[in-house]
């Protein structure tokens, strides 16, 4: 956030940029957390926009019995590997076709034992606060589907009638990795020393990292005619003085008419 300065006071302003702000010849360039002419004000909202999608990766091993292993399958650029990859991908696309989160498979290694296929099943979902549950459910369905297909599509009399056949006992799930996204943690980190006062609130399933000085949220502090300002001790209302009133109180809700005070003082003296 930047504030431009014109005139004689500018050089003076340059040495007074606060909170890590830097002078660029015209204005104080403020770090993310601050704004104002001298970077003296703390922002009331921080952009922690979530990623559009969250991914998960399942490390699986299956044993394909309908292809005889050859050394060429170890070479990822060989004709044999490329063809195996194409057929395996097509088969897995059929297996997982009912899973909306399914993106595809990635073969990491082929090794001897019929053909042992070490691969990743890739899952993706749109970000919502429930993304963990969505991906956990998807990984369970993947396990169910791969277990089912490797039990059903088996060699009979040393021949396969399906696109691919499997060894029922060769199916293993090694590891499941879900991209971590924790808006509360991100919010705390980005708010730095003000982390205790910033909270995450959701609107249309999107997280907003806000302090009570940001209006329009359930935690928003109502300063009435005053101005909410963040300090290291938390949000505070700076009350205003108008031509006719002084305002005071924690939320600037107590107005005192100047004329009454002056009248009283005048009368007193």
């Amino acid at each position: 956030r930047t504030t431009t300065c014109f005139g004689d006071g500018c050089q003076n302003t340059a040495s007074r940029c606060k909170n890590g702000g830097t002078w660029d010849g015209l204005k104080c360039q403020c770090p993310n957390l601050y704004y104002g002419e001298l970077c003296e004000e703390v922002v009331s909202s921080i952009d922690i926009g979530p990623p559009e999608t969250i991914s998960a990766q399942m490390e699986l091993t299956v044993t394909v019995t309908s292809v005889k292993f050859t050394e060429e399958l170890k070479n990822h650029s060989s004709q044999e590997f490329q063809e195996f990859k194409q057929t395996f991908t097509e088969q897995m696309n059929i297996v997982y076709s009912g899973i909306p989160e399914y993106v595809g498979v990635n073969i990491t290694k082929l090794r001897l034992g019929s053909v042992v296929v070490e691969h990743d099943v890739l899952l993706r979902t749109k970000y919502t606060p429930e993304y963990k549950t969505v991906l956990d459910n998807a990984t369970e369905v993947v396990k169910e589907k791969i277990t089912k297909v490797t039990t059903q599509q088996i060699m009979i009399n040393d021949i396969c009638s399906d696109m691919m056949c499997f060894n029922t006992t060769g199916t293993q799930v090694q590891n499941i990795t879900v991209t971590q996204y924790d808006p509360e943690e991100d919010c705390r980190k980005m708010a730095k020393e003000y982390g205790d006062y910033f909270v995450v609130e959701y609107r249309d399933q999107k997280p907003y990292c806000i302090s009570p000085c940001e209006p329009g949220f359930s935690v928003s502090k109502n300063c009435n005619l005053g101005k909410c300002q963040m300090s290291l001790s938390g949000p505070q209302c700076l009350c205003v003085t108008t031509e006719t009133h002084w305002y005071s109180g924690e939320t600037c809700n107590q107005g005192t008419q100047k004329s009454l005070v002056y009248g009283h003082h005048h009368h007193h003296h």
């Epitope: 019995t65 005889k68 004709q79 063809e83 396969c160 009638s161 696109m163 056949c165």
Partner: nanobody, 124 residues
Framework: DVQLQASGGGSVQAGGSLRLSCAAS????????MAWFRQAPGKEREVVAF????????YYADSVKGRLTISHDNAKNTLYLQMDSLKPEDTAMYYC?????????????????WGQGTQVTVSS
């Protein structure tokens, strides 16, 4: 890429013989799988026989065992199907298929490379 060219089809009386050929090109290895499939009108494509070109395996459908013989000439990269004691139910379009893998599946979806068909008609 792998290319297949099938030939040798024709019309024959029941009990007669035919020999189908399928020339292959584009392989980087001399060890792969080749197969003959057939498709009669209104029916699904079915396997007739397959062979590994290293001689490691041959397979025949029950309906053709003892009458049809699959073979491969490595020097010519050509697949053959010797068809003897032909029956009217052998009438179909015959296709050769190939894979760079040593396949043990009779499902046509597992075979990526296909030649154009050659018609075999057996009349009684």
């Amino acid at each position: 890429d792998v290319q297949l060219q099938a030939s040798g089809g024709g019309s024959v009386q029941a009990g007669g013989s035919l020999r189908l050929s399928c020339a292959a090109s584009g392989y980087t290895s001399n060890r792969y799988s080749m197969a003959w499939f057939r498709q009669a009108p209104g029916k699904e494509r079915e396997v007739v026989a397959f062979i590994w070109t290293d001689g490691g395996r041959t397979y025949y459908a029950d309906s053709v065992k003892g009458r049809l013989t699959i073979s491969h000439d490595n020097a010519k990269n050509t697949l053959y199907l010797q068809m003897d004691s032909l029956k009217p139910e052998d009438t179909a379009m015959y296709y050769c298929a190939a894979s760079s893998l040593l396949l043990q599946t009779i499902n046509p979806r597992a075979w990526p490379y296909w030649g154009q068909g050659t018609q075999v008609t057996v009349s009684s």
